[in-house]
Amino acid sequence: QQQTLPKPFIWAEPHFMVPKEKQVTICCQGNYGAVEYQLHFEGSLFAVDRPKPPERINKVQFYIPDMNSRMAGQYSCIYRVGELWSEPSNLLDLVVTEMYDTPTLSVHPGPEVISGEKVTFYCRLDTATSMFLLLKEGRSSHVQRGYGKVQAEFPLGPVTTAHRGTYRCFGSYNNHAWSFPSEPVKLLVTGDIENTSLAPEDPTFPADTWGTYLLTTETGLQKDHALWDHTAQNLLR
């Protein structure tokens, strides 16, 4: 006999990285017929919704009208059909950005390089933080962590065309509170020998520094830009 229902999916719109004082919507998708959804924040009940009519609705939206550091953290949701509750969703890490200061991002030897060259990004922030994050823009939002007193370096190693793209960095005051983003740096990689049509959309990085956020079959159920909790779930682990 089934004791629990399958876990729902949770994601944030427009993004899990939310500028302070901006609004974010947390979506929870369960099953048609669910009579109640609960959103939990850091283990405590945060909001409740009972969709009507339940048989025609399988997703609810929870709102955070005014993002701040108190609202940044881990969210999960559950739903109920009759008296039977679901397993909890994966954790969604909601991050508040645009806190305090703006870091500076630079790249060595420069933004235009030849395939095979070693490239290093430098993120600098003169205020009290020792953790830095480098993000490559794109559907799978790769995040690399680096550490340093006022500056962190992010060696990409020998680059390929897969490394092409726009990068930004953040200073991190804690796991869920990040600085303003740096100005973007666009990396252009030319002269690649390999067949570029076979190059992956995003490069693979050493497991100890990069989270690889692959779109799973779960994600296929939703809009492409909704990365669910996979990005956020892996981001801070």
């Epitope: 709102y63 009208p65 609202m71």
Partner: nanobody
């Protein structure tokens, strides 16, 4: 900016009753969404004991169900909490709180059967009124 001012707290014997009031000023109830009474007791997190949303739907924490009643008087711009059959464990500081209006947030926010339970989702808070229940 909505301002909330509580009154009606005091000391009472177990089994007695109190009625808390929360006056909404600098704005009106029309500029809020969910309204709630939160209770802060020593050594415990602040919890929502009673919530009423813009549709007039109510929600109570299990420990006060059947004893407490939350109500809004929109004409008087007042939120009330009628507390009957009070118990010593009801002792604590009681705060009135309100969220932003759904018009500024999103359709469905604090309407129908949507309740904001966690205190972090409330934008406006009163200063609190103390309730002491002795055995």
């Amino acid at each position: 900016e909505v301002q909330l001012v509580e009154s009606g707290g005091g000391s009472v014997q177990a089994g007695g009753s109190l009625r808390l009031s929360c006056a909404v000023s600098r704005g009106s109830m029309a500029s809020t969404g969910c309204m709630a009474w939160f209770r802060q007791t020593p050594g415990k997190e602040r919890e929502a004991v009673a919530i009423i949303n813009i549709s007039g739907t109510t929600r109570y924490t299990d420990s006060v169900k059947g004893r407490f009643t939350i109500a809004q008087d929109s004409a008087k711009n007042t939120l009330t909490l009628q507390m009957n059959s009070l118990k010593p464990e009801d002792t604590g500081m009681y705060y009135c709180a309100a969220t932003q209006n759904p018009r500024t947030v999103g359709r469905g926010y604090c309407t129908g059967d949507y309740f904001q339970v966690g205190g972090g989702g409330y934008s406006f808070w009163g200063q609190g009124t103390q309730v002491t229940v002795s055995s």
